[in-house]
């Protein structure tokens, strides 16, 4: 492959000074040393030979020749001190020295960056020996320039635990502009403003940051990389993208979309997960967010019988897990139900209402006036009482449950009598005389059991005796009452 | 501070030419493209076009192509609006104004009245 | 191109009156900006991208819209508001203004 290699008319940076030398267009050695050349033995360096040692390390050997003359300082020959070349082409650069054939086992090692290359790299040493000298020529071909082949390479030679290492080659890989820092996608307040970062590099640099909204530039010069652009506030949403250029051409950033944070659509799907006499279990699907999460959602519950206040009851809650237990509902009761959802921005509309009732719950409140009193001739309790409020049937009456608990020398029996819901009285036998019996009763639906009413307590005296003034349950606040007859 | 400073008051004869300097400090010159707008006497403003002031490419508005000319001195940090042929509709204010991000013209120089008249 | 259509052309207002200013775009455009000009003055920035007052703009001044309807919005008119209001289209080429709209104080 051809290498495109140039050597820059100034000194690069990295590496102030000339850089003497050819420059490579092929696969050839840079310094071929052809054996009838007229290529001058290692001991007849001339100061003012161009190949002459020049700035890398030099080993100064201690050993003499035949004529006992000092044998000239070691150092790598100059070649080639930057090359610069385009992503993806081939590369090839070596070093050379000329070794005296008294040294033996020379290895060439080549180093990156500071870094010793290893394995699968493409380096190849060559020997052309002489009568005195060895010369050795170090090549390192890279077939596929990237990125990551930008650098400085030297050679590095050991002989006599002296280290020689050759002037740094400084690869340059140039290419397209390559993005180090993209604008990303965002959800932005309305007339916000709001800034975007690009960024590339090159090489080549510099690298000038254009930057695109909705296909139009924004700046009709280019900016240095990096670029900051501010964006004044969007109304509605707008695709952004940044071009990046240097002298190799340009690279296009992805688009990204900016959009407007809204108020949230309505949540869909509101359904009934499960119904008690005084809470109802409901489930909703979240609406489209308006680009902005959502903080809480809002139950708005109303009763739906056309005879009521139409009041509305509010319950808060947060936006997970879309789940929400409805309580304090009353039973057997309809109830229109609709979900609304918030925001940063604001709440979304109301989903549309659904309709869910309560199931029949065991009565809130036990019977109400319950008078007890002894009908001695039949030898029978009688118990009255008033049927609680409709309200607080909390379902369809059924019946009624009562507790009587007889009561003597120290034995004590509680027997229940279940009454239908027709009426409100009831006649029990006597099961114990000269004892204190404690009458309890609550409204049965078919939800359950509602409470006992307070106790009433009414004394059955031995056979004989007359009374018959009725027990009754007392006013509020009189605890225990008992009734002696 | 950013400022345009532009040439003084010309008149000329129908079919001459004109040029209106646009000389700007306060800011690098190269890094904003300078734009020029006309105004005719009790009339709106008018977009000419744009000079990109770091490759020196000029822009021009369709109704201003031909005897329009804009050009660079970035040695002095001048643009330069060239007139040709003149014609007395080409009797007008002319302002340069600096490009900025959404074509929003920040800094204004301060007009120039370009009479032509025989 | 894109054709501003600014309503209305002049307008005589008394001071502490609110003025509405209207720049209509005959297709949609990104942001609006709008210029005060005083007779025998260069025009000064006044607000940038439809809403962003420039700097030394009184907060009496405001601008909103989108896609076709831009509107400059004066509070409370002051005396030294008298001046011709241009609104400024970006979004595409070429750059174009409204025709102008002249407030004259009563």
């Known amino acids: 492959a051809i290498t495109e290699a140039r050597e820059e008319a100034k000194p690069y940076p990295l590496f102030p000074g000339p850089f003497p030398g050819s420059l490579q267009t092929d696969h050839t050695p840079l310094l071929s040393l052809p054996h009838a050349s007229g290529y001058q033995p290692a001991l007849m360096f001339s100061p003012t030979q161009p190949g002459r040692p020049h700035t890398g390390n030099v080993a100064i050997p201690q050993v003499t020749s035949v004529e006992s003359k000092p044998l000239p300082p070691l150092a790598f020959k100059h070649t080639v001190g930057h090359i610069i070349l385009s992503e993806h082409k081939g590369v090839k650069f070596n070093c050379s020295i000329s070794v005296p054939n008294i040294y033996q086992d020379t290895t060439i090692s080549w180093w990156k960056d500071g870094k010793e290359l290893l394995g699968a790299h493409h380096a190849i040493t060559q020997f052309y020996p002489d009568d005195e000298v060895t010369a050795i020529i170090a090549s390192f071909s890279i077939t596929s320039v990237q990125r990551s082949d930008n650098g400085s390479y030297i050679c590095k030679m050991k002989i006599n635990n002296e280290e020689i290492v050759s002037d740094p080659i400084y690869i340059e890989v140039q290419g397209l502009p390559h993005f180090t820092k993209q604008p990303e996608s965002m959800n932005v307040t309305r007339n916000t403003a709001f800034n975007l970062t690009c960024q590339a590099v090159g090489p080549p640099e510099p690298v000038n940051i254009f930057w695109v909204q909705n296909s139009s530039r924004v700046n009709e010069q280019p900016e240095k990389s990096p670029s900051v652009l501010t964006v004044p506030g969007l109304t509605e949403m707008a695709v952004f993208s940044c071009e990046a250029h240097n002298d190799k051409g340009l690279t296009v950033s992805k688009g990204v979309q900016i959009n407007i944070k809204a108020i949230p659509s309505p949540p869909t799907e509101v359904s009934i997960r499960n119904s008690t006499a005084h809470s109802i279990l409901i489930s909703w699907v979240p609406g489209f967010d308006g680009y902005s999460p959502f903080r809480n959602c809002s139950i708005q519950v109303k009763e739906a019988d056309p005879l009521s206040n139409g009041s509305v009851m509010i319950f808060n809650t947060s936006a997970l897990p879309h789940l929400y237990q409805i309580k304090q509902l009353q039973a057997l009761a309809n109830y229109s139900i609709g979900v609304s959802c918030m925001n940063e921005i604001g709440w979304s509309a109301v989903s549309p209402w659904i309709l869910a009732s309560t199931t029949e719950g065991a009565p809130s409140v036990a019977p109400l006036n319950v008078t007890v009193f002894l009908n001695e001739s039949s030898d029978n309790v009688d118990i009255r009482w008033m049927k609680p409020p409709t309200k607080q049937q909390d379902g369809e009456l059924v019946g009624y449950r009562i507790s009587h608990v007889w009561q003597s020398a120290g034995i004590s029996k509680e027997l229940l009598e279940e009454v239908g819901q027709n009426g409100s009285r009831a006649r029990i036998s006597v099961q114990v005389h000269n004892a204190t019996c404690t009458v309890r009763i609550a409204a049965v639906t078919r939800g359950g059991v509602g409470p006992f009413s307070d106790p009433v307590k009414i004394f059955i005296p031995a056979h004989g005796w007359v009374d018959y003034a009725p027990s009754s349950t007392p006013a509020p606040g009189n605890a225990d009452p008992v009734l002696i007859i | 501070q950013v400022q345009l400073v532009q040439s003084g008051s010309e008149l000329k004869k129908p079919g001459a030419s004109v040029k209106v300097s646009c000389k700007a400090s306060g800011y690098t010159f190269t890094n904003y493209g300078m734009n020029w707008v006309r105004q005719a006497p009790g009339q709106g403003l008018e977009w000419m076009g744009w000079?990109?002031?770091?490759?020196?490419?000029?822009t021009y508005a369709d109704d201003f192509k031909g005897r329009f000319v804009f050009s660079l001195d970035t040695s002095v940090s001048t643009a330069y609006l060239q007139i040709s042929s003149l014609k007395a509709e080409d009797t007008a204010v002319y302002y340069c104004?600096?490009?900025?991000?959404?074509?929003?013209?920040?800094?204004w120089g301060q007009g120039t009245l370009v009479t032509v008249s025989s | 191109e894109i054709v501003l259509t600014q309503s209305p052309d002049f307008q005589s207002v008394t001071p502490k009156e609110k003025v509405t200013i209207t720049c209509r775009a005959s297709s949609s455009v990104s942001y609006m900006h709008w210029y005060q000009q005083k007779p025998d003055q260069s025009p000064k920035p006044w607000i940038k991208?439809?809403?962003n007052l420039a700097s030394g703009v009184p907060s009496r001044f405001s601008g909103s819209g989108s896609g076709t309807d831009f509107t400059l919005t004066i509070n409370s008119l002051e005396a030294e508001d008298a001046a011709t209001y241009y609104c400024q289209q970006w979004g595409t080429k070429p750059l174009t203004f409204g025709q102008g709209t002249k407030l004259e104080i009563k």
């Open positions: 991208a439809t809403s």
């Open positions: 000079i990109n002031t770091y490759t020196g490419e000029p």
């Open positions: 104004a600096r490009y900025g991000h959404y074509a929003w013209f920040a800094y």
